[in-house]
Interface confidence: medium
């Protein structure tokens, strides 16, 4: 069971990143699915290595004082959402914006029907060029 | 099937990074090989988690305005090269240069004879001290 | 065999990061253990994908000129410690400090009784908020 999906620009104001089965994507079988373009949902319980990469372009003056944060989050059936992993990068002073990349990855136990998704502080700063922003998992 | 190779300084003007089976490297068997010191080639079709880490030292004034970009690329037999993953970091203002590290990783389907390699915008900025820059894969 | 442990703030002056089995941690079985809150020790020989993520907050003026460095290190029975992976990030100019995240990961052969741990140049700069700093491995 494995998946690798590609970032998709979205006009939605939500902080949850959108993904698509496009380009050189992976979706090994129907035991993992991309739901609503925003979350990877697994049908089998087990240990999974889950990862996300987010490239963004921001400028210190044009952004809030808070850093850019990417969060890998889990929603299990009947449970509250929870943060699995986070990474933070202070905004660049480069003009008009400075690019930076964040990589998240870790091993987690997922229940049947569990979904994972990626949250960012400002989706408008995310880079959607080929290969820059992606999300995936693999069952151990 | 797994491999982990170590960066090798090279004066070649190519943007493709060079690697070596040295130090604490891994080459599990002959189903994955390091070819010409530049690409990992697999003999078996399947899903692979492929990763690369690149540490570089650059300065905003001494570098081009474009960011430092590391790309993980795929060359399948009879196909054009394609980018699998990219990461970008704006150059540092630190003198003489500021170090930064990039990590790339994702799950991809590889065909028999497929090769993966790592491209950077400026190989002369890459750090080759122990553990700073490496490249590998594992078959799921 | 898999583990994922969560960073723990420590008053110890050591550069070795401390970890805990808390929050959404993983410890698949007793073939991998967290020893002294600082190292993951494996009982079985084999290839492992080992990873660490460190988020830190630093300021160029308040820090030494040297960058922040995170090192993934190996201690095998009867052998000297050795560096497997390192990543470096120059300190931010943001006040009071600028957050940055480092991700390390690679495939390595471990012997029975081998331990892996994470070293940083300045543990006081490490961020211990939920999901920011973690460490784990999985056996291939």
């Amino acid at each position: 069971i494995a998946a690798h999906v590609i970032s998709e620009a979205s006009s939605k104001t939500t902080s949850v990143l959108q993904w698509a089965e496009k380009g050189y994507y992976t979706m090994s079988n129907n035991l993992v699915t991309l739901e609503n373009g925003k979350q990877l949902t697994v049908k089998r319980q087990g240990l999974y290595y889950i990862y996300a990469q987010v490239t963004f372009c921001s400028n210190r003056e044009a952004s809030s004082q808070a850093p850019f944060i990417a969060s890998l989050c889990l929603k299990s059936p009947g449970r509250f959402e929870r943060i699995l992993l986070r990474a933070a990068n202070t905004h660049s002073s480069a003009k008009p914006c400075g690019q930076q990349s964040i990589h998240l990855g870790g091993v987690f136990e997922l229940q049947p029907g569990a979904s994972v998704f990626v949250n960012v502080t400002d989706p408008s700063q995310v880079s959607h060029g080929t290969g820059f922003t992606s999300f995936g998992l693999l069952k151990l | 099937i797994a491999a982990h190779v170590i960066s090798e300084a090279s004066s070649k003007t190519t943007s493709v990074l060079q690697w070596a089976e040295k130090g604490y490297y891994t080459m599990s068997n002959n189903l994955v090989t390091l070819e010409n010191g530049k690409q990992l080639t697999v003999k078996r079709q399947g899903l692979y988690y492929i990763y690369a880490q690149v540490t570089f030292c650059s300065n905003r004034e001494a570098s081009s305005q474009a960011p430092f970009i590391a790309s993980l690329c795929l060359k399948s037999p009879g196909r054009f090269e394609r980018i699998l993953l990219r990461a970008a970091n704006t150059h540092s203002s630190a003198k003489p240069c500021g170090q930064q590290s990039i990590h790339l990783g994702g799950v991809f389907e590889l065909q028999p004879g497929a090769s993966v390699f790592v491209n950077v915008t400026d190989p002369s900025q890459v750090s080759h001290g122990t553990g700073f820059t490496s490249f590998g894969l594992l078959k799921l | 065999i898999a583990a994922h442990v969560i960073s723990e703030a420590s008053s110890k002056t050591t550069s070795v990061l401390q970890w805990a089995e808390k929050g959404y941690y993983t410890m698949s079985n007793n073939l991998v253990t967290l020893e002294n809150g600082k190292q993951l020790t494996v009982k079985r020989q084999g290839l492992y994908y080992i990873y660490a993520q460190v988020t830190f907050c630093s300021n160029r003026e308040a820090s030494s000129q040297a960058p922040f460095i995170a090192s993934l290190c190996l201690k095998s029975p009867g052998r000297f410690e050795r560096i497997l992976l390192r990543a470096a990030n120059t300190h931010s100019s943001a006040k009071p400090c600028g957050q940055q995240s480092i991700h390390l990961g690679g495939v390595f052969e471990l012997q029975p009784g081998a331990s892996v741990f994470v070293n940083v140049t300045d543990p006081s700069q490490v961020s211990h908020g939920t999901g920011f700093t973690s460490f784990g491995l999985l056996k291939l």
């Epitope: - | 004066s11 003007t13 002369s124 001290g129 | -």
Partner: antibody, heavy 125, light 103 residues
């Protein structure tokens, strides 16, 4: 201030071995690559060997490859050059040198930002 | 590495010494007499140590590096070596040295 003090020079016989030691102070030794460079009488500078910050990566000049070993002790802030099977052409002044870029190693003679005073080696029967 | 064997200049003039044939970064090292310790003027192409006078500067274009001495002084009379990286051996390399004579 950065200081690099070499020792171990003197008269050596052909076929023998020498061990040069460089004691460093005034900087965080464990963060920098180090090099040995030599100069034969009346000649130019010649790269001998280089070692990275933690001692895991080394490189050697063509004239000494296979005969030389560079090593370091970060606890003692020393770097050592062992040269075996000495030849007359190994005669010269041996300088210890420090890389100028922290944690960045490429065995590159363009990185040197500080030099020792040198130790003279004579290989003669 | 290739550098001129000698250059000469009057006090106050600007001197440029070139070095080519390397592939990594270049450094410039001054040696006032044979056997005396070299002094780093420039490393990493254009970085000047804090104790070196600002009349010394370095630049690189392509694979050619240039050491510029603006307003040369009598005390600058010395041999100047460039250092760099050899692409075939993955090792350091030096030029043969340029003797600067101040007239």
């Amino acid at each position: 201030a950065v200081t690099l003090d070499e020792s171990g020079g003197g008269l050596h016989t052909p076929g023998g071995a020498l061990s040069l030691v460089c004691k460093a102070s005034g900087f965080t030794f464990s963060s920098y690559g180090m090099q040995w460079v030599r100069q034969a009488p009346g000649k130019g500078l010649e790269f001998v060997a280089a070692i990275d910050d933690d001692g895991s990566s080394t490189n050697y000049g063509a004239a000494v490859k296979g005969r030389a070993t560079i090593s370091r002790d970060n606890g003692q802030s020393t770097v050592r050059l062992q040269l075996n099977n000495l030849r007359a052409e190994d005669t010269g002044t041996y300088y210890c040198a420090k890389d100028g870029i922290i944690y960045y190693w490429n065995a590159d003679a363009g990185y040197i930002d500080a030099w020792g005073h040198g130790t003279e080696v004579i290989v003669s029967s | 590495l290739t550098q001129p064997s000698s250059v000469s200049a009057n006090p106050g003039e600007t001197v440029k010494i070139t070095c080519s044939g390397g592939s990594g970064s270049y450094g410039w090292y001054q040696q006032k007499s044979p056997g005396s310790a070299p002094v780093t003027l420039i490393y990493w192409d254009d970085e000047r140590p804090s104790d070196i006078p600002s009349r010394f500067s370095g630049s690189k274009s392509g694979s050619t590096a240039t050491l510029t001495i603006t307003g040369v002084q009598a005390e600058d009379e010395a041999v100047y070596f460039c250092g760099g990286y050899d692409d075939s051996s993955y090792a350091g390399i030096f030029g043969a040295g340029t003797t600067l004579t101040v007239l």
